[in-house]
Amino acid sequence: QTSVFPPEVILPRGGSVKVNCSASCDQPISLGMETPLPKKEILPGGNNWKMYELSNVQEDSQPMCYSNCPDGQSSAKTLLTVYWTPERVELAPLPPWQPVGKNLTLRCQVEGGAPRANLTVMLLRGEKELSRQSAVGEPAEVTTTVPVGRDDHGANFSCRTELDLRPYVLKLFENTSAPHQLQTFDLPATPPQLVSPQVLEVDTQGTVVCSLDGLFPVSEAQVSLALGDQKLNPTITYGNNSLSAKASVKVTAEEEGTQQLLCGVMLGNQTQETRQTVTIYSFPAPNVNLTKPEVSEGTEVIVECEAHPRAKVMLNGVPAQPPGPRAQFLLKATPEDNGRSFSCSATLEVAGQLVHKNQTRELRVLYGPRLDEKDCPGNWTWPENSQQTPMCQAWGNPLPQLKCLKDGTFPLPIGQSVTVTRDLEGTYLCQARSTRGEVTREVTVNVLSPRYE
């Protein structure tokens, strides 16, 4: 009988081992070892035994010892088990963004490593074990599926192999892949809320607000606001899980017509959009025309209001007849019409909304100068030593200058409070003068003396 010692060995790849082959008889006819491995006989051996050193053991092998004794030929094998840690442990790249609530498949590839019976592959989140499987195939591929929540954002996932050689009194060899950081996101199925004017006038400024709630991580969300081809530059305010983008928009005549207002919120690899139609319109203020802005009293004046062809106008609150973009009326200018405002209101329907524009013109009526009994009484009688205020108002446009003189030199203090004395008595010539001419009027002041008893 042939014996081999040790019958089983576990050794590192590339390692060497000494193996003893022995025969049961004292003087074997032949004794040796068959192996494809590099071998060296260690001398001296014994009568019935030989020692061999096997080197550079790269893979599992079963060298065979044989002996030929008088009672027959026999053989015995030694089982060489090679161990080595994997050459590659790699976690497949994670998606750039992973939606919350959707399962994530983790895939790990392991190249090499032996003995495979002792090689385990683990998928980890941080240091938490998600899955533990045997390494099967070359390369071994291990997968597991995990649900993804918001708390997985920024989590590191990795793959680890354990070559457990503790049954052989060796140790536990660990190899860990480079970690991959997961970026999760939650973009609600609801589109953003878009608040904007439905109609917008050329060369005016409007405000657009786009908001969306339930975003995670909100800081990574991007907002795109555009009106037609015009990209808007919003100011973004972030809440806990919400954002609000506010932008000012100014439109030009080239953009007149129906435009699409678009708000897109981009997070991860997904976008939620809201579109809204905005009608851009041009609506100049109506024109109010007076035949002449400045006329003399008694002159006939035509007041005319003209607006946008599709507008309807009202002139001084009176609608055009028939309703339309033009209205006019005729008047004979009186002093009372001086400073009178003529207001034209135009209304235009844009996308179902009524928009209004107003324009006002003032009429100047030239009249006078005038000195009336009502405003400049011809006779005053005042007690001596009483306090009085002489009043005389001249009228006209332009406003006339007024002078009241006695004997051409002594002025009547118009509008001033005076103590009535004898020298105030007399007849005054009041003269009102403007660029339109002059008028005069005599004003007599009588002073009553007190009675002494």
Partner: antibody, heavy 124, light 109 residues
């Protein structure tokens, strides 16, 4: 991972007895050994035999050859058959798992997992 | 026959101290063949050191093995009361001869 011995008993001199070692948490594969070691009351440890988990090849201490036979009965059990027992065989019998540790050449057994032991008493 | 001799059957030391246990072999032992075990009453042995100086998994670094050829030593430093036990050396020899030393009891005071 654990080992458990069973079959220990009180027997008369000259009797035979079979001890069983059951492994759990690991299965048989090449490269490691299951061995039997005994300890007489108040005495030191004494190696009896080892069997290769993959090959089933058994090796004995010189004093145990012929009287003791070690066998692998399944991937998780090994037995030790003992014959012609004497009072000197009274001991706690441990089964142990070990490796044949190789570094720069020839190696040796060492045991990193032991069962709690089973008591064999040989007495008339 | 190959014999492993542990000269001291018992040694004592104080908590925090250091104890050294020697083991001598009648024949040269390859460094990979020598191991040290710790055994407490009523328990199976526990592997401490293998390949003369390699610490087994989970064993504190207070345990240190050294030596080669025929002379080997186990040193236990920063002694704890839990270190009170019997310590065995064990070696393997060419031709599948395996032996345990007689054991050294360590008393911690």
């Amino acid at each position: 991972q654990s080992l458990e011995e069973s079959g220990g008993d009180l027997v008369k001199p000259g009797a035979s007895l079979t001890l069983t070692c059951t492994a759990s948490g690991f299965s048989s594969s090449s490269g490691y050994y299951i061995c039997w070691v005994r300890q007489a009351p108040g005495k030191g440890l004494e190696w009896i035999a080892c069997i290769g988990a993959g090959s089933g090849a058994a090796y004995y201490a010189s004093w145990a050859k012929g009287r003791f036979t070690m066998s692998k009965t399944s991937s998780t059990t090994v037995t030790l058959q003992m014959t012609s027992l004497t009072a000197a065989d009274t001991a706690t019998y441990f089964c142990a798992r070990g490796g044949f540790v190789v570094g720069g050449g020839y190696g040796g057994y060492c045991f990193n997992l032991w069962g709690p032991g089973t008591l064999v008493t040989v007495s008339s | 026959a190959q014999v492993l001799t542990q000269t001291a059957s018992s040694v004592s030391a104080t908590v925090g101290g250091t104890v050294t246990i020697s083991c001598q072999s009648s024949e040269s032992v390859d460094v990979n063949n020598l191991a040290w075990y710790q055994q407490k009453p009523g328990q199976p042995p526990k592997l401490l050191i293998y390949s003369a100086s390699t610490l087994a998994s989970g064993v504190p670094s207070r345990f240190k093995g050294s030596g080669s050829g025929t002379q080997f030593t186990l040193t236990v430093s920063d002694l704890e009361s839990a270190d009170a036990a019997t310590y065995y050396c064990a070696g393997g020899y060419s031709g599948n001869i395996f032996a345990f030393g007689g054991g050294t009891a360590v008393v911690v005071k």
